[in-house]
């Protein structure tokens, strides 16, 4: 699996999550989020510069799982990548 990183962007708060997703040698076509304890994947919205956002009416519950489909057709899933108590500007990589 190529290296993937998730950077929590400025503006993220309890009801808004903005994440820059980088995938070695590829770009994201679709990114989805599953909150802790949730049974459903929700689509994130593509913004400028590879930033993906999600807005919620209720406070978001971490840690957060992500799955994605890349422009080259790669599909992957990563559990608990961004922790519940994330730091704005921090870059998180899946644990190995």
């Amino acid at each position: 699996v190529p290296k993937v990183t998730f950077t929590v962007e400025k503006g993220s708060n309890e009801k808004h999550l903005a994440v820059l997703v980088k995938y070695e040698g590829d770009t994201m076509a679709e990114v989805e989020l599953r909150e802790h304890g949730s049974d459903e994947w929700v689509a994130m919205t593509k913004g400028e510069g590879g930033v993906w956002t999600f807005d919620s009416e209720e406070p978001l519950q971490g840690p957060f799982n992500f799955r994605f489909l890349t422009e080259k057709g790669m599909k992957n899933v990563f559990d608990d990548v961004v922790p519940e108590k994330y730091t704005i500007g921090a870059t998180y990589a899946p644990e190995e």
């Epitope: 799955r67 899933v77 990563f78 644990e95």
Partner: antibody
Framework: LESGPGLVKPAQTLSLSCAVS??????????WSWIRQHPGKGLEWIGY???????YYNPSLKSRIAMSVDTSENKFSLRLNSVTAADTAVYYC??????????WGQGTLVTVSS | ELTQSPSSLSASVGDRVTISCRAS??????LNWYQHKPGKAPKLLIY???SLQSGVPSRFSGSGYGTDFTLTISSLQFEDFASYYC?????????FGQGTKVEIK
Amino acid sequence: LESGPGLVKPAQTLSLSCAVSGGSIRSGGYYWSWIRQHPGKGLEWIGYIYHSGNTYYNPSLKSRIAMSVDTSENKFSLRLNSVTAADTAVYYCARLDGYTLDIWGQGTLVTVSS
Amino acid sequence: ELTQSPSSLSASVGDRVTISCRASQRINTYLNWYQHKPGKAPKLLIYAASSLQSGVPSRFSGSGYGTDFTLTISSLQFEDFASYYCQESLSASYTFGQGTKVEIK
């Protein structure tokens, strides 16, 4: 590749493992799954596990299931306790990429009988 | 919950075959199709309702959105006699339909 006993006695525990080749479980990116098919029936989800140990179990089987991962041996395992004849099935391990089951094992028949 | 129809069908080589899968709630395009032959591992055919998995013949196609989905085999070949399953990927439970068996007429 699934491995384990083909015959299990009622009330005992069914134990299966799946050896993963062609990539490291530890590198992440996938859920590692178990699916079964009862004779003449359809496919039934058992559950899946992430390399960190996070699990999702079929609610109807949850009370009897345990899944685990051994990253050092690059394999994952299923334990199903208190088995009955209704657990007789072909058991498959598979890789779940978050969307699809893209790679499957060949399956192993487990018969529950005394 | 996913409901497939018919549960079985008989067809001849060269026939156009369609299998339906209906979801109990909207799942957008989060729907996959698998082929399963006795004694073999199931094989992914279609993902995201209409995307053909690499290596799968173009006679297989998928369509649909929301709650109603279709798998079509444009010209049935001998090797296509098998069972077919839909599966949703919106929820963490990744539920399967009950299957459709395609038999030789």
